[in-house]
Interface confidence: low
């Protein structure tokens, strides 16, 4: 891989957990300035698959709260307004990295962990197996 | 809020930034321990708004890699395999938290990011705006 | 840090009013749109309302036009919503929210304030 050469102005990284450990600045900088919510913020409802958005809250992770998609239906909206079950909603999931207090309730000290959210639905034509 | 004890094996927190500066032990830990790639692996494609998706590549990220998803075609598919443009493949995005390196190119320093991706696409009824 | 507090919930009759109320802190308020969003026991999460940054535009899901008023008062950092000639099936906790409602997962949500409708 390409090598890039180390900042001189870098922490120190005596640490002999180092490099497994790192320091992590919590002043988030929001890179999605140009995005229209506007646009996209009903389509949970709007949708041919639609999904309910369920609050996950839990007070020693980072960020706490996370909602969660869960479809409403197993089949798919059709054009009358009708769920036609020959079409599939399911949910698209999504791993993300939060930040787990560790040790528990410690205010400065976290450990990377990897979730699962389902952050929508969409509708899928179903895999029929055919029995002989 | 709920006030949780602070653990007294916490580590020292008399670094001048705290609490917006903490350390993080990037050993992640993975909780999808029951998930099945292979259910949701071929949504992409089997979906009424299929999807193609895009490897975005940043070093200076944590993660360094993050596939974006782009709907494939401004309508959707009907049962006929056609487009059908009276509906919409729109994406469905989410904010996730990354780690930016930060000053550049430090290898145990972080700041952390939010940015937007699109996860996958969903079929929406449009929004048809009538003149008068 | 960002923190939005609602308050003004409570138990109201069929057909009565109430105004909620949330405090902003943390972000520089006028540069979003706001939201109202509500989960009913059991129920999934509903946006309710939403008001552009300055005010001019205002939206609303069907089941409330008509009934309730979102606005806000920039100088003051808060956000309003006037509910009138509420109903059983408006009983839920009513959080206000910052910008976008998809599936986020920032805690960019107050803890909600419960409103109970019934007779």
């Known amino acids: 891989g390409i090598t890039i050469p180390r900042n001189p102005g870098c922490p120190n990284s005596e640490d002999k957990n180092f490099p497994r450990t790192v320091m992590v600045n919590l002043n988030i900088h929001n890179r999605n300035t140009n995005t229209n919510p506007k646009r996209s913020s009903d389509y949970y409802n709007r949708s041919t698959s639609p999904w309910n958005l369920h609050r996950n809250e839990d007070p020693e992770r980072y960020p706490s709260v996370i909602w969660e998609a869960k479809c409403r239906h197993l089949g798919c909206i059709n054009a009358d307004g009708n769920v036609d079950y020959h079409m599939n909603s399911v949910p698209i999931q999504q791993e993300i990295l939060v930040l787990r207090r560790e040790p528990p309730h410690c205010p400065n000290s976290f450990r990377l962990e990897k979730i699962l959210v389902s952050v929508g639905c969409t509708c899928v034509t179903p895999i029929v197996h055919h029995v002989a | 809020g709920i006030t949780i004890p602070r653990n007294p094996g916490c580590p020292n927190s008399e670094d001048k930034n705290f609490p917006r500066t903490v350390m993080v032990n990037l050993n992640i830990h993975n909780r999808n321990t029951n998930t099945n790639p292979k259910r949701s692996s071929d949504y992409y494609n089997r979906s009424t708004s299929p999807w193609n998706l895009h490897r975005n590549e940043d070093p200076e990220r944590y993660p360094s890699v993050i596939w974006e998803a782009k709907c494939r075609h401004l309508g959707c598919i009907n049962a006929d395999g056609n487009v059908d443009y009276h509906m919409n493949s729109v994406p469905i995005q989410q904010e996730i938290l990354v780690l930016r390196r930060e000053p550049p190119h430090c290898p145990n320093s972080f700041r952390l990011e939010k940015i937007l991706v699109s996860v996958g696409c969903t079929c929406v009824t449009p929004i048809v705006h009538h003149v008068a | 840090e960002v923190q939005l507090v609602e308050s003004g919930g409570g138990l109201v009759r069929p057909g009565g009013s109430l105004r909620l109320s949330c405090a902003a802190s943390?972000?520089?308020?006028?540069?979003?749109?706001m939201y109202w969003v509500r989960q009913a026991p059991g129920k999934g999460l509903e946006w309710v309302a939403k008001i552009e940054q300055d005010g001019s535009e205002e939206y609303y899901v069907d089941s409330v036009k008509g009934r309730f008023t979102i606005s806000r008062d920039n100088a003051k950092k808060s956000l309003y919503l006037q509910m009138n000639s509420l109903r059983a099936e408006d009983t839920a906790v009513y959080y206000c929210?910052?910008?976008?409602?998809?599936?986020?997962?920032?805690?960019?949500w107050g803890q909600g304030t419960l409103v109970t409708v019934s007779s």
């Open positions: 929210a910052k910008g976008e409602i998809l599936p986020l997962y920032f805690d960019y």
């Open positions: 943390g972000f520089t308020f006028s540069s979003y749109g």
